[in-house]
């Protein structure tokens, strides 16, 4: 592009500015020396006067104006033939340039295309590739599937013929145990039968062993008796001789005071001279009702009366009233003596209570209490404790002060609950107190963090069911 | 097998707070008495707190009231002690203990199964 332009500069000369794309090019046109400086009488664009001026003059001046008009006129075109001159060659240098330009852009172009041509390409023969291998790898695929299937078809027909076999065999063994059904029922009922004959016969054996015991007891208190009686004879015969033998002597026998045969409690047992421990029969205060409890006759001086005795688990505590009352178990093992005979029995003399404790860990432990009775009835056997010592704890597991007797079927506790039936078995619990010696037995190892087991928190704590209990008493002056 | 056991005991500045927790298995969880009991070194074992313990209530020794809190989340058998503005008294070996009685005292001998126990150790 090209555009010109003309202009006076500061000095006021003129000059031609010629602007061609990048380049701009500045002409000074050189100043004409014939030209009058402003302070002539005639400046060369003053107004005309109206006086003329001289002729040769204005010749003259015409004559300059044409010579500088010439010069101005040859040296503008030189100046048109050198811009002219100036113009092509720029014009061709800008023509190739753009041209060069062109083609630069055009080969920038063509080669993008190439590349993206062959970039293309390249993806396409990868895809394709990668379709052979998915190919491939499909029919692959399907050559082992369909290898699998065989297989398979196989399997599932062995299979057949074996479940075909195993049905066989099956209804054979069906077969079988239904004859042997049969057999074993015919079997069954047989042993059935010698099952009932043997209950009748262990039955028969059991009364026959009561009354064994029945007679062993009696004939260890009759033996017992039997050597009291022949000592006494031997005394009183030593005596008559020695009268005898005395010529002084008066011939009179003193008469021996009648042998009591009837027993309150161990300690008159034991007094009486019978020492050995076991089995006796103890009658009820002014009554001919009997009873029969173990007697410890080794254990502190012996005279010992057992009310209750715990050892393996084999009698179930959790009674009622009545059996509690009673008294149930067997004074050869596991027992309750009966709360109405120690009633009555603790009512008329001042008795003492020994506890005696087992754990599991081989330890023992006892309490004793100074004064122990068992109100009556009426007042559902409430317990009364005082004067505490022992081994099996500073306190007393038993609460104070005393509580009325619960079981299963009397709740007679201090609790919004029935202690005896969550605890189990019948005791004085208070709500529900630190002791229960009649719980429910526990095996070694299977003792610990028990709800209802054989329970006597100031010795073991709370939870510990203990291995062995036993509650005895004796008159406190015996 | 009646199986209790806590967590939650630490070492924590006084005025600070401890959460105890105790897992129980082996019995009906719901029908239980839980208390929380604890011992300090020398001294007794004492009821801090129960729950279920007096018709379905909850209850607190004096020296607890106002500043320790029980819970239960009976969907995981668990039994809470949250323990707030702790002091230096407040050391001890703290035990969960479960009872098949409803009570409204906290006596340690109306508690049959016990936890092993957690120590809670409060700094001044």
């Known amino acids: 592009y090209s555009n010109f332009r003309k202009s006076v500069d500061s000095t006021g000369r003129r000059q031609y500015q010629v602007q061609n794309g990048p380049c701009s090019y500045t002409f000074l046109l050189p100043e004409t020396d014939s030209c009058r400086s402003s302070s002539s009488p005639y400046m060369s664009n003053a107004v005309q006067r109206d006086a003329p001026l001289d002729y040769d003059d204005s010749v003259q001046r015409l004559q300059v104006l044409e010579n500088i008009l010439e010069n101005n006129t040859q040296w503008l075109m030189k100046l048109e033939n050198y811009i002219q001159d100036n113009m092509k060659k720029e014009m061709v240098e800008i023509q190739q340039n753009v041209v060069q330009n062109q083609t630069a852009v055009m080969i920038e172009i063509g080669t993008s295309l190439l590349n993206q041509t062959a970039a293309q390409t390249r993806k396409l023969t990868d895809v394709e590739a990668q379709v052979l291998n998915q190919t491939t790898r499909l029919e692959l695929q399907l050559l082992q599937h369909s290898i699998s299937t065989n297989k398979l078809e196989k399997q599932i027909l062995d299979q057949t013929s074996e479940i075909n076999k195993l049905q066989n065999k099956n209804s054979f063994l069906e077969q079988k145990v239904l004859d042997m059904e049969g057999k074993h029922s015919e079997q069954l009922q047989s042993m059935k039968e010698q099952k009932d004959e043997l209950q009748v016969l262990v039955s028969k054996q059991s009364s026959v062993i009561d009354e064994l015991e029945k007679k062993l007891v009696t004939a260890t208190v009759n033996n017992s008796l039997l050597q009291k009686q022949q000592h006494d004879l031997m005394e009183t015969v030593n005596s008559l001789l020695t009268m005898m033998s005395s010529p002084n002597s008066k011939s009179s026998v003193a008469i021996r005071k009648e042998e009591q045969t009837t027993f309150r409690d161990c300690a008159e047992i034991f007094k009486s001279g019978l020492t050995t421990s076991g089995i006796y029969t103890l009658t009820f205060p002014n009554s001919t009702e009997e009873i029969k409890a173990y007697c410890d006759m080794d254990v502190g001086g012996g005279g010992w009366t057992v009310i209750q005795h715990r050892e393996d688990g084999s009698v179930d505590f959790q009674r009622t009233w009545k059996e509690y009352k009673e008294g149930f178990g067997s004074p050869l093992g596991e027992y309750w003596l009966g709360n109405e005979f120690v009633s009555q029995l603790t009512g008329q003399h001042r008795y003492v209570l020994k506890i005696q404790l087992k754990d599991w860990e081989g330890n023992e432990a006892h309490s004793l209490y100074d004064h122990f009775y068992l109100a009556g009835e009426e007042s559902n056997y409430r317990i009364h404790l005082t004067g505490l010592t022992g081994t099996a704890g500073k306190i007393s597991s038993i609460s104070q002060p005393g509580s009325d007797f619960s079981t299963k079927d009397s709740d007679n506790d201090k609790c919004i609950c029935k202690c005896s039936q969550m605890l189990s078995g019948g005791w004085w619990f208070d709500a529900c107190g630190p002791s229960n010696l009649n719980g429910q037995y526990y095996p070694q190892k299977q003792n610990t963090n028990k709800f209802n087991g054989i329970k006597w928190y100031y010795w073991k704590g709370s939870g510990y069911s203990l291995k062995a209990t036993t509650m005895m008493i004796r008159p406190a002056d015996f | 097998e009646v199986q209790l056991v806590e967590s939650g005991g630490g070492l924590v500045q006084a005025g600070g707070s401890l959460r105890l927790s105790c897992a129980a298995s082996?019995?009906?969880?719901?029908?239980?008495?839980l208390g929380w009991f604890r011992q300090a070194a020398g001294k007794e074992r004492e009821g801090v707190s129960c729950i279920r313990c007096s018709d379905g209530s909850t209850y607190y020794a004096d020296s607890v009231k106002g500043r320790f809190t029980i819970s239960s989340d009976n969907a995981k058998n668990t039994v809470y002690l949250q323990m707030n503005s702790l002091k230096p008294e407040d050391t001890a070996v703290y035990y969960c203990?479960?009872?098949?009685?409803?009570?409204?005292?906290?006596?340690?001998?109306?508690?049959?199964?016990w936890g092993q126990g957690t120590l809670v150790t409060v700094s001044s």
């Open positions: 082996g019995f009906t969880f719901d029908d239980y008495a």
């Open positions: 203990a479960a009872s098949i009685v409803p009570r409204s005292k906290l006596e340690p001998y109306e508690y049959d199964a």
